[in-house]
Interface confidence: low
């Protein structure tokens, strides 16, 4: 999915007045250096297609993410604010369904949060520019 | 725990210049801004300006623009503010502070100790 | 460039007794940090975005505002509230407002 076309200010105002919070929660008593940043992303569309890949596809040691509340809010805010985004997620939700995990929160789901912590925080965060 | 330390004392001549450094550690360098503030001897706080240490951008009030150059090095952790053209109203502490937006705004979360710096022939 | 105003200059007031500190900002603004000083020592963030007190930050204190007026009140000062208080916005670049001085009368 192309993310060119979001409202990011709709999206930004999401994250700051609730997945924000969910992500936190989720990291509860986790030290916040405790993880080392290693994704970026070098402008909003790509922050945010980073996110949809971290928040949504099961990873190694990893596979529950997506029925968190943050994960939630998350697509919500995709498919209000991304023209079309609905539309392409329909299969990839299907499949998922097929291969949901019992849900446990691992030190490797906890270091995974910690990274979408860093793309959530780049993204609300456009760069200065250049002088 | 984030902590930012701040080079030594400096006493200058009108004229020169002097670079401030800012050690960062306690959190990822990369993630925030670092502001510059001088605080003049009985004066109010005025911000000179601001940092990405993540791709160098920049941006500075317009009193500084010219004479402030910010810059950082990333695999240091530290951020860099240089002052050229000295002059006796330079004389001020320099703070560097972090700047973070938690609680929906962009607050500076964490300072320096503060940098002396003396202009005087 | 935003212009904060703060009022009063210097506030002389009693332990036990409210401190209100006022800053008015030139244009509207989204909201208002406040900050803390003590002589030789670094600014400390006091109140963030209008109303959330920082960390370690007692109850007496609270802040209130929006548009170009904002408010730090202090109900009951204590010997340690007495400090500069220096409001900041980020709106348009950042600036400082000239700072409120809590003395003991």
């Known amino acids: 999915y192309d993310f060119t076309n979001c409202d990011f200010e709709k999206i930004k105002a999401a994250y700051l007045s609730t997945i924000s919070k969910d992500l936190i929660t989720y990291m509860s008593g986790t030290k916040s250096t405790e993880f080392n940043n290693t994704v970026s992303c070098s402008n909003r569309p790509h922050c945010l297609t980073e996110i949809q890949s971290l928040t949504f596809n099961p990873t190694a040691g990893c596979a529950s993410l997506a029925k968190e509340m943050f994960a939630m809010k998350t697509k919500a805010a995709l498919a209000i604010w991304c023209p079309g985004y609905s539309e392409t997620q329909i299969n990839a939700t299907q499949a998922m369904k097929k291969r949901r995990k019992r849900k446990v929160t691992t030190n490797k789901c906890l270091e995974q949060v910690s990274q979408l912590q860093g793309l959530w925080r780049r993204f609300n965060r456009p760069l200065l520019k250049q002088q | 725990e984030v902590q930012l330390v701040q080079s030594g004392a400096e006493v200058k001549k009108p004229g020169a210049s002097v670079k401030v450094s800012c050690k960062a550690s306690?959190?990822?360098?990369?993630?925030?801004?670092m502001n510059w503030v001088k605080q003049a001897p009985g004066q109010r706080l005025e911000w000179i300006g601001i940092i990405s240490p993540y791709n160098g951008g920049t941006s500075y009030n317009q009193k500084f623009k010219g004479r402030a150059t910010l810059t950082v090095d990333k695999s240091a952790s530290t951020a860099y503010m240089e002052l050229s053209s000295l002059r006796s109203e330079d004389t001020a502490v320099y703070y560097c502070?972090?700047?973070?937006?938690?609680?929906?705004?962009?607050?500076?979360?964490?300072w320096g100790q503060g940098t002396t710096v003396t202009v005087s022939s | 460039e935003i212009v904060l105003t703060q009022s009063p200059a210097t506030l002389s007031l009693s332990p036990g007794e409210r401190a209100t500190l006022s800053c008015r900002a030139s244009s509207s603004v989204s909201y208002m940090h406040w900050y803390q000083q003590k002589p030789g020592q670094a600014p400390r963030p006091w109140i963030y975005a209008t109303s959330n007190l920082a960390s370690g930050v007692p109850a007496r204190f609270s802040g209130s505002g929006s548009g170009t007026d904002y408010t730090l009140t202090i109900s009951r000062l204590e010997p340690e509230d007495f400090a500069v208080y220096y409001c900041?916005?980020?709106?348009?670049?950042?600036?400082f407002g000239g700072g409120t001085k809590v003395e003991i009368k």
């Open positions: 306690g959190y990822t360098f990369t993630d925030d801004y």
């Open positions: 900041q916005q980020w709106s348009s670049n950042r600036t």
């Open positions: 502070a972090r700047e973070d937006y938690d609680y929906d705004g962009y607050a500076m979360d964490h």
